[in-house]
């Protein structure tokens, strides 16, 4: 297993609709053809694999399971979007990148993006 640098923004504010997007960039030391990206949430004394995707370079990301994430890739960048977030989902979201093929296997883990989610205020009652 070889180490690899992964960069991601320090802070992101989710939209009022509970959507947060950020870029995860990795310094690929070679020509990887198969890449796995996992988003981890570290908060509340827990570590959770929020979503994971495997993709072949140049193709769309295919997310596993009941994913609340979507994303696209461009070169060594992955554009990740997490949907359906609420204030309680605020936390540190860490990007983990694995170069699966061809060998050797590389692993990189970012420092995390602190995603802040603010629940929208309910609209006041209207007389109209």
């Amino acid at each position: 297993c070889k180490a690899m640098h992964v960069a991601q923004p320090a802070v992101v504010l989710a939209s009022s609709r509970g959507i947060a997007s950020f870029v995860c960039e990795y310094a690929s030391p070679g020509k990887a053809t198969e890449v796995r990206v996992t988003v981890l949430r570290q908060a509340d004394s827990q570590v959770t694999e929020v979503c994971a995707a495997t993709y072949m370079m140049g193709n769309e990301l295919t997310f596993l399971d009941d994913s609340i994430c979507t994303g696209t890739s461009s070169g060594n960048q992955v554009n990740l979007t997490i949907q359906g977030l609420r204030a309680m989902d605020t936390g540190l979201y860490i990007c983990k990148v694995e170069l699966m093929y061809p060998p050797p296997y590389y692993l990189g883990i970012g420092n995390g993006t602190q995603i802040y989610v603010i629940d929208p205020e309910p609209c006041p009652d209207s007389d109209f």
Epitope: V50, L64, D89
Partner: nanobody, 125 residues
Framework: EVQLVESGGGLVQTGGSLRLSCAAS????????MGWFRQAPGKDREFVAA????????SYADSVKGRFTISRDNAKKMAYLQMLFLKLEDSAVYYC??????????????????WGQGTQVTVSS
């Protein structure tokens, strides 16, 4: 709801290992996110680990990360908790639980509506 029965608990020395099993019956097992919780005497029930419906995504409490591994076999309607390097503070009754919801960011708070009867894990020095 599904019916859940845990097994595999017991007495083990510090540093030892156990594998807990959770057998499900009833509704379609693969529709449920599965979780493990534990409760020590005089303490609140706490989240240990959870696994998504297909088994591809997992969540762990910091206190067990790297020592415990959650897994599932949908064909056999089973969930498992492999526990290594057990510590005195791991002693508790361990419960298997099922939540009929998809995965998300905070599986510890999912609406687990099915619970097993629990299995006792005792770690001694």
């Amino acid at each position: 709801e599904v019916q859940l029965v845990e097994s595999g608990g017991g007495l083990v020395q510090t540093g030892g290992s156990l594998r807990l099993s959770c057998a499900a019956s009833g509704r379609t097992f693969s529709n449920y996110t599965m979780g493990w919780f534990r409760q020590a005497p005089g303490k609140d029930r706490e989240f240990v680990a959870a696994i998504s419906r297909s088994g591809s995504l997992k969540s762990y409490a910091d206190s067990v990360k790297g020592r415990f591994t959650i897994s599932r076999d949908n064909a056999k309607k089973m969930a498992y908790l492999q526990m290594l390097f057990l510590k005195l503070e791991d002693s508790a009754v361990y419960y298997c639980a099922a939540a009929p919801v998809p995965w998300g960011t905070r599986p510890s708070t999912f609406p687990y509506d099915s619970w097993g009867q629990g299995t006792q894990v005792t770690v001694s020095s």
